[in-house]
Interface confidence: low
Amino acid sequence: QNLFTKDVTVIEGEVATISCQVNKSDDSVIQLLNPNRQTIYFRDFRPLKDSRFQLLNFSSSELKVSLTNVSISDEGRYFCQLYTDPPQESYTTITVLVPPRNLMIDIQKDTAVEGEEIEVNCTAMASKPATTIRWFKGNTELKGKSEVEEWSDMYTVTSQLMLKVHKEDDGVPVICQVEHPAVTGNLQTQRYLEVQYKPQVHIQMTYPLQGLTREGDALELTCEAIGKPQPVMVTWVRVDDEMPQHAVLSGPNLFINNLNKTDNGTYRCEASNIVGKAHSDYMLYVYDPPTTIPPPTTTTTTTTTTTTTILTIITDSRAGEEGSIRAVDH
C-alpha cells in the first residue's frame, strides 16, 4: 500500500483540504470520490457539479483538493483511489465542527435577596459535538448540572446553576463560559447579580476626637448604615432608658451637649430596609472632669497623667432585633 491520506477536522463554513498522496509513484491515475462515491476529481478533471471543490495541486504523487464553505452535510468518508494493479483505495474522514449557534443566559430573577438560592440557566444551542459549559462567579469556578439534547446530529446543552447569593455577590458577574473545539478563545456571556441585603450598621464617634468623654464635654456620634436598598430608616434610641432631654438628633447624628453622669448608658443606632433590621450599640461612660492642681509657691513640678480610654461598641449585624454579636475593642 503506497496511497496515504489524513483525516480532516474543519469548522462549519471554513475550508477543508483533502490530500491523496502517493509514495513510489508510477504515474497511475488518482481519483477522489465523495461519501456517495461520486467522483469529484479524476486526475485534474472535476466531473462533479459542485464548484466548492477546487484543485490545489495535481501531480503523479499528489491530488490535493479544497472544499470551501463546508457544511455538516459534507461530513463523512472521502475515498482516494489509485489505479494501480491491483487498484488501491484509502479514505479520509472529514469531521465538521459546529460552534454553538447562540449562547443564552437566563437568571431566575433580576434582583435577589441575600441568602436566597436562585437558578441560573445557560443554553448553548446547536453545536457539534456537544458543548462543555463552565460557570464562574467573578473569578471563582462553580459547578453546574448539564443536560444534552440531540437533534439531527446537533446538540443543545443546557446547564443549570443553583446559586445561594450573599451581599458580597452584588454587582459580581455570573459568567457562562463555553468550551468547544470549534471555538478559539473565550466564548462567554455574563449577567451581573443584583443582591439586596440588610443594613450593616457602624457607629463612629466624631467628637471628642481622642475618645475620652468627660463631664461637661459634648459628644457627637455618627451612625453609618449601608444596605441595599439603602436603609430608609436610621434611628437613635437609648437602651433601657429615655434619651436625655439635652440630646439632639439630626439624621444619622446624635449630639449630647454638657455631658453628665446621668447620661451613662447604651445608645443604639437602628437601621432597616426591606430585607431586615440591624443595630449597633455605643456604651457611653462619662468620666470626671479633669482636676486642676494649683501651682506651688516655691518649686515647679511637671505632672504627666496617662489616660486609658475604653471605647466599647457592640454590633448586631443580623436581621431582626433579638440577640447580638458582641465585638468589643479596647
Epitope: 447562540n102 449562547l103 443564552m104 433580576d110 467573578g138 473569578n139 458580597e168 455577590d169 452584588d170 454587582g171 459580581v172 458577574p173 466564548l187 462567554q188 456571556t189 455574563q190 449577567r191 451581573y192
Partner: antibody, heavy 115, light 107 residues
Amino acid sequence: QVQLQQWGAGLLKPSETLSLTCAVYGGSFGGYYWGWIRQPPGKGLEWIGEINHSGSTNYNPSLKSRVTISVDTPKNQFSLKLSSVTAADTAVYYCARGGWYPDPWGQGTLVTVSS
Amino acid sequence: SSELTQDPAVSVALGQTVRITCQGDSLRSYYASWYQQKPGQAPVLVIYGKNNRPSGIPDRFSGSSSGNTASLTITGAQAEDEADYYCNSRDSSGNVVFGGGTKLTVL
C-alpha cells in the same frame, strides 16, 4: 451613591495617543466592570471596552488593536489609552460602571483631534 | 454598522403616548436597556431588565420586549422628555452594543 469623575487631555494631534483616567467615588470598586464609551459629535454611542478590578479586559473588536484599558485598584481608578488617533476619534468620551447596562456615567470629556 | 436598529426620529404630541423600538438578534435572548440623553449631558439610564426603572425615573417610562424587538414606551409624554434615546445590550460575544439612537420630539 457611586460617582465617576474623569479627566485627560482634550486636544490632540493626529497620530498621538489619547489618555483619559476615571476615578470612582462612593462605592465598591471590586466586583464590577468599568468601561469607556464614546460619542462623536452629533452621532450615537460606541462602546470602547471594559476592565474589572483584577485587570480582565473586553474590547470592542473594531478598536481592539489601538485600545488599552488599565486599572489602578488601590486608587479606585481606571484609564483609557487610544493610540494613533485621527480626526475620526474626535468625540465625547465617557467612563461608566460596566455591566449588562453601563450605569452610572462620568460627566464626559470632549477630545478633539486636529492638526 | 450597529447590531441594534432604531428609528432615527419619532415625534409625539404633548400628553400622548409614544413607543420607541429597537431591533437586533441579541434581543431574542436578552433584554435591552434604555438611556435618555439631553444635549450636552451624559446618558441617563431609564429602563433596564424586563421593565425596571432606576430611582428618580418617572413611572410614565416603561419597557417591553417581544421576539427580537425591545420597546420603550412613554405614557403621557412631557416637554422634558424631548431627548435622544438609546437602546443597549450585549452580543453573543459579550460585547456591549448600542442602537443608533432615536431623537424624540414633543410637539
